[in-house]
């Protein structure tokens, strides 16, 4: 029986041009994590395998960094990075656990404008 649960950073936002850490954590199970896949809307971002280490998809190599831990760091964010991200934990003997994170990338100029021209 699968007893584990995935805790994620949930819904997060970040500024265009900045970076963000995507984190998932598997708890409440003694299952061994053999591999974690990071995906964005039917695209492979990266894989961390217990034996082979990290593989970053070639199209994301310039903007994705492995870690910290089993997490993933997205850099040089664009508005197009807004969307759902999934961490898929492959475990033995439990099977597969999936966590979801929603990232919203905000126009930095809009954020600055809002902060700069607030009415007291």
């Amino acid at each position: 029986m699968m007893t584990g649960t995935i805790e994620t950073t949930g819904n997060i936002s970040a500024e265009k041009g900045g970076s963000i850490i995507l984190q998932c954590h598997l708890s409440s199970t003694t299952a061994q994590v053999t591999q974690v896949n990071w995906e964005q809307q039917d695209q492979l971002l990266a894989i961390c395998n217990a034996d082979l280490g990290w593989h970053i998809s070639p199209s994301f190599k310039d903007r994705v960094a492995p870690g910290p831990g089993l997490g993933l760091t997205l850099q040089s964010l664009t508005v197009n990075d807004t969307g759902e991200y999934f961490c898929i934990y492959h475990t033995y003997p439990d099977g597969t656990y999936t966590g979801r994170i929603f990232l919203e990338v905000l126009e930095s100029s809009v954020a600055e404008h809002g902060a700069r021209f607030q009415i007291p």
Epitope: Q35, D42, Q43, L44, N49, D51, L52
Partner: antibody, heavy 118, light 107 residues
């Protein structure tokens, strides 16, 4: 340089047995899942079987389930396929392939021909 | 089992042509789609993995796209050494399955 070298193929009568081997070199064999894929003469590719890195789990195509057994010896860097109760339709070139991250087959052996005929 | 349907089964093209091969899965397979090239008497060679990632050492004229059920392999400018048979393969679930192949011949 990654190398996979299959051996053990040959001519066998229907109902007979063969054991194929795949000798691996040039990489850390014990870190990779390994698969067998076959190709009948003039036909397409058919997946046969897979085994994970530590031999803890394996899977088979329905066409060979109960007749073929995949195994590996990580101390010898060798993958095996024990084929029993062979049928004419098992006639094919058998390839072993390395499968990193369980998703793609990045290196293949040159293949070994198995012919089942009376 | 997931069925993989490739089209066309064969095509004739000239050096320099743009060639497109399609592969359709019988159910959604996300990005779990790979493309291989095979020449007569040789083992298959990985070209594209995870739908769109170019395997190291493969020329950039090869590209892959798609997700879910519909995928495409494109050769932007066909070269003499590209005349071969191409297979798609899903690794979403076992049994792993291949498309029937597309033979690219010289026109």
């Amino acid at each position: 340089e990654v190398q996979l070298l299959e051996s053990g193929g040959g001519l066998v009568q229907p109902g007979g047995s063969l054991r194929l081997s795949c000798a691996a070199s040039g990489f850390t064999f014990s870190s990779y899942s390994m698969h067998w894929v076959r190709q009948a003469p003039g036909k397409g590719l058919e997946w046969v079987s897979a085994i994970n890195s530590n031999a803890g789990s394996s899977s088979y195509a329905d066409s060979v389930k109960g007749r073929f057994t995949i195994s590996r010896d990580n101390s010898k860097n060798t993958l095996y396929l024990q084929m029993n109760s062979l049928r004419a339709e098992d006639t094919a070139v058998y390839y072993c392939a390395r499968v990193p991250y369980g998703v793609w087959m990045d290196y293949w052996g040159q293949g070994t021909l198995v012919t089942v005929s009376s | 089992d997931i069925q993989m349907t490739q089209s066309p089964s064969s095509l004739s093209a000239s050096v320099g042509d743009r060639v497109t091969i399609t592969c359709r899965a019988s159910q959604s397979i996300s990005y779990y789609l790979n493309w291989y090239q095979q020449k007569p008497g040789k083992a298959p060679k990985l070209l594209i993995y995870a739908a769109s990632s170019l395997q190291s050492g493969v020329p950039s004229r090869f590209s892959g796209s798609g997700s879910g059920t519909d995928f495409t392999l494109t050769i932007s400018s066909l070269q003499p050494e590209d005349f071969a048979t191409y297979y798609c393969q899903q690794s979403y679930s076992t049994p792993l399955t291949f498309g029937g192949g597309t033979k690219v011949e010289i026109k």
